[in-house]
């Protein structure tokens, strides 16, 4: 006896109660591949989740996180809270960056300020909880009598602040 179920396309299921007729998936369900004997229940994006893509008869809904949260896990299975700039997310919630560290993102951890003196430079702009320090010319360049024709030292490459 030929299995007629293999002929059932995505968006349908093989209804054994009706002589293996291909029946459309009921509302709020889907089948993403052919030959399915059941349709899967659509994911519901509610609460802290919001719908990024509606469920169709052939594909599941896709969720995102509402404002103030970001996705974690496969297919945004979890929502983790954002913190403010100048904070980091710990196991016990958002905590301010300690002195000498900063975070300019809504997620991630606080990182140490750049140590300008390692590059032979001085601090031009002090760091804050939200911003790294800005390094300026070396102290020698700022001393009286220093040649103003000395070109400034090359800037740090972006993304190379110490971790």
């Amino acid at each position: 006896l030929q299995d007629l179920c293999s002929n059932c396309p995505a968006g349908t299921f093989c209804d054994n109660n009706r002589s293996q007729i291909c029946s459309p998936c009921p509302p709020n369900s889907f089948s993403s591949a052919g030959g399915q004997r059941t349709c899967d229940i659509c994911r519901q994006c509610k609460g802290v989740f919001k719908t990024r893509k509606e469920c169709s008869s052939t594909s599941n809904a896709e969720c995102d996180c509402i404002s103030g949260y970001h996705c974690l896990g496969a297919e945004c299975s979890m929502c983790e809270q954002d913190c403010k700039q100048g904070q980091e997310l710990t196991k016990k919630g958002c905590k301010d960056c300690c002195f000498g560290t900063f975070n300019d993102q809504k997620r991630g951890i606080c990182r140490p300020w750049t140590n300008c003196s390692l590059d032979g430079k001085s601090v031009l702009v002090n760091g804050t909880k939200e911003r790294d320090v800005v390094c300026g010319p070396s102290p020698a360049d700022l001393s009286p009598g220093a040649s103003s024709a000395t070109p400034p030292a090359p800037a740090r490459e972006p993304g190379h602040s110490p971790q």
Epitope: L89, T90, K91, K92, I109
Partner: nanobody
Framework: EVQLLESGGGLVQPGGSLRLSCAAS????????MTWVRQAPGKGLEWVSS????????YYADSVKGRFTISRDNSKNTLYLQMNSLRAEDTAVYYC?????????????????WGQGTTVTVSS
């Protein structure tokens, strides 16, 4: 491939108990700290408890301290969460997670792999 598979969730009455398990594979289980987190309906992720790779250090969120116990059996590559005196506010999807090192604390998240979750419903 690193995999974490939770089980043991279900419906329980307030005051009741449940024991969640998390079967780990694809990595040297005893070398890594493990963590339980949960997500209640309509809320964000909440840290529950963490345990070091050797099992000698454990940490708990204030909301579960004295009611939940985290443990591990490194010979079986399994993490556990014994939940007693359950309350309605413990209703959530519980996820087991692998941390990036063998040590842990109640401060930094250091999670690099998540399980799929198991649902715990506390209701009369």
């Amino acid at each position: 491939e690193v995999q974490l598979l939770e089980s043991g969730g279900g419906l329980v009455q307030p005051g009741g108990s449940l024991r969640l398990s998390c079967a780990a594979s694809g990595f040297t289980f005893s070398n890594y700290a493990m963590t339980w987190v949960r997500q209640a309906p309509g809320k964000g992720l909440e840290w529950v408890s963490s345990i070091s790779g050797s099992g000698d250090s454990t940490y708990y969120a204030d909301s579960v301290k004295g009611r939940f116990t985290i443990s591990r059996d490194n010979s079986k590559n399994t993490l556990y969460l014994q939940m007693n005196s359950l309350r309605a506010e413990d209703t959530a999807v519980y996820y087991c997670a692998k941390e990036g090192t063998g040590t842990t604390s109640d401060y930094y998240y250091n999670v690099d792999v998540w399980g799929q979750g198991t649902t715990v419903t506390v209701s009369s």
